[in-house]
Amino acid sequence: EEELQVIQPDKSVLVAAGETATLRCTATSLIPVGPIQWFRGAGPGRELIYNQKEGHFPRVTTVSDLTKRNNMDFSIRIGNITPADAGTYYCVKFRKGSPDDVEFKSGAGTELSVRAKPSAPVVSGPAARATPQHTVSFTCESHGFSPRDITLKWFKNGNELSDFQTNVDPVGESVSYSIHSTAKVVLTREDVHSQVICEVAHVTLQGDPLRGTANLSETIRVPPTLEVTQQPVRAENQVNVTCQVRKFYPQRLQLTWLENGNVSRTETASTVTENKDGTYNWMSWLLVNVSAHRDDVKLTCQVEHDGQPAVSKSHDLKVSAHPKEQGSNTAAENTGSNERNIY
């Protein structure tokens, strides 16, 4: 009689994570008497996957009833496959022995490859806000995919970005992989409504890539522009001065009025108006009683935006002249009107 052969007909099997893998094995003879066992890997460190008579293998079931007379089918199913299950599986026939059964013949092995989807990409931006014209970095991470081949793209408002670096780890063989990418984005004043998108394409996604997004509203700070104007006189001894705070983001803003360097009033931006580009405008006004001043008055609008150093704009109010209609921003009225930082 011909010597027993162990046949594993499939050189390789490809299974999606979460599914069941079927590993086929048949023997050509019932002799010698002894069990079949399944291992992952070869050599002394191989892992026992299934032993018919003894052991706890909750994910493994046999395809046929091994106790049936003349059974020579030793195929198994492994449920709920994960990337960690990848490897080469051997069906091994043992001969009865004492104290241990003796390995008699092994199948050629079946390589189990696992396809696993990447996790949803997570995009994170810089810890601190940055202003327009600055370059900021965004990172994108996705984990747990297999095989290693993967494509990652960056977009800003639908336009593909080119300034990015991507790494897939580990470099060598692994049960699953991770991808990490860093993209550089130049901010503009119009970016409050902008989005940065990281797109990951993988064979397991069947042409439907995964996307992670970051809103630039979380990253950008648009500093305000200030304009101080003097309105027509309401009454003979009162002048209305306004401070227009324009195009700022985020909303967090505190404004202080100074009369000749002395704090007159402090207020926090509340009822702001929103521009189409997502930035905000706000206006504060100060009613100055001219009769209370003998000399000219220097009015300063000082703005602290989003915890940044204050910026200010000043307006010189001439007490001597009381024109009925005082225009705005004339040289006489606005001598010190350049923006400056107050530390």
Epitope: G45, R46, E47, K53, E54, H56, D65, L66, T67, D100
Partner: antibody
Framework: EVQLQQSGAELVKPGASVKVSCTGS????????LHWVKQRPEQGLEWIGR????????KYDPKFQDKATLTADTASNTAYLQISSLTSEDTAVYYC???????WGQGTLVTVSA | DIVLTQSPASLAVSLGQRATISCRAS??????????MQWYQQKPGQPPKLLIY???NVGSGVPARFSGSGSGTDFSLNIHPVEEDDIAMYFC????????FGGGTKLEIK
């Protein structure tokens, strides 16, 4: 549902024999070894031996070789443990257990007393 | 036979703390790359319940606070955080050659 149902408690005299049964349901009775374990009051667990119901092959701990006999009847899905020449040292709870470590019978208390 | 020496024989742990039980085998319980070592919990009047199989795999329905580690001859069972329901006897078992059990550890609450 997988179950191993053991026979009830036994009170036996010294020198006599006792036969404890273990009936399986919810699984293929022949597909795994069936083991027997002894636990004396307030003591640890001692392995007695195991039987392969598929072919009746047995293996014993040398300590129980002349004390215990394991048999199986696949028609009734039942395994048996027979203990002979009983002494007070044999007073214990006897468990049957499948080779997958998970499924154990509820235990049978055998009390040896004159 | 492979002899299993379990320690300590008894252990008193405060609720929420970690309990560690050790089991040393007189020879390796490795079967190729797999450690054939199990851990059981037994409560009075009940059969043993499988907690850990093949040294580090947690049994079905067993809470994640139970974990096993080790290979070759030295193994341990960890319970963290210990709960009131964990008061029981704990046994290690090797199945490399027939079956043998450790002497048991009685877990109590301080």
């Amino acid at each position: 549902e997988v179950q191993l149902q053991q026979s009830g408690a036994e009170l036996v005299k010294p020198g006599a024999s006792v036969k404890v049964s273990c009936t399986g349901s919810g699984f293929n009775f022949k597909d795994m070894y069936l083991h027997w374990v002894k636990q004396r009051p307030e003591q640890g667990l001692e392995w007695i031996g195991r039987i392969d119901p598929e072919n009746d092959s047995t293996k014993y701990d040398p300590k129980f070789q002349d004390k215990a006999t394991l048999t199986a009847d696949t028609a009734s899905n039942t395994a048996y443990l027979q203990i002979s020449s009983l002494t007070s040292e044999d007073t214990a709870v006897y468990y049957c257990a499948r080779g997958n470590y998970v499924h154990w019978g509820q235990g049978t208390l055998v009390t040896v007393s004159a | 036979d492979i002899v299993l020496t379990q320690s300590p024989a008894s252990l008193a742990v405060s609720l929420g703390q970690r309990a560690t039980i050790s089991c040393r085998a007189s020879e390796s319980v490795q079967y190729y790359g797999t450690s054939l070592m199990q851990w059981y919990q037994q409560k009075p009047g009940q059969p043993p319940k499988l907690l850990i199989y093949a040294a580090s795999n947690v049994g079905s329905g067993v809470p994640a606070r139970f974990s096993g580690s080790g290979s070759g001859t030295d193994f341990s069972l960890n319970i963290h955080p210990v709960e009131e329901d964990d008061i029981a006897m704990y046994f290690c078992q090797q199945t490399r050659r027939v079956w043998t059990f450790g002497g048991g550890t009685k877990l109590e609450i301080k």
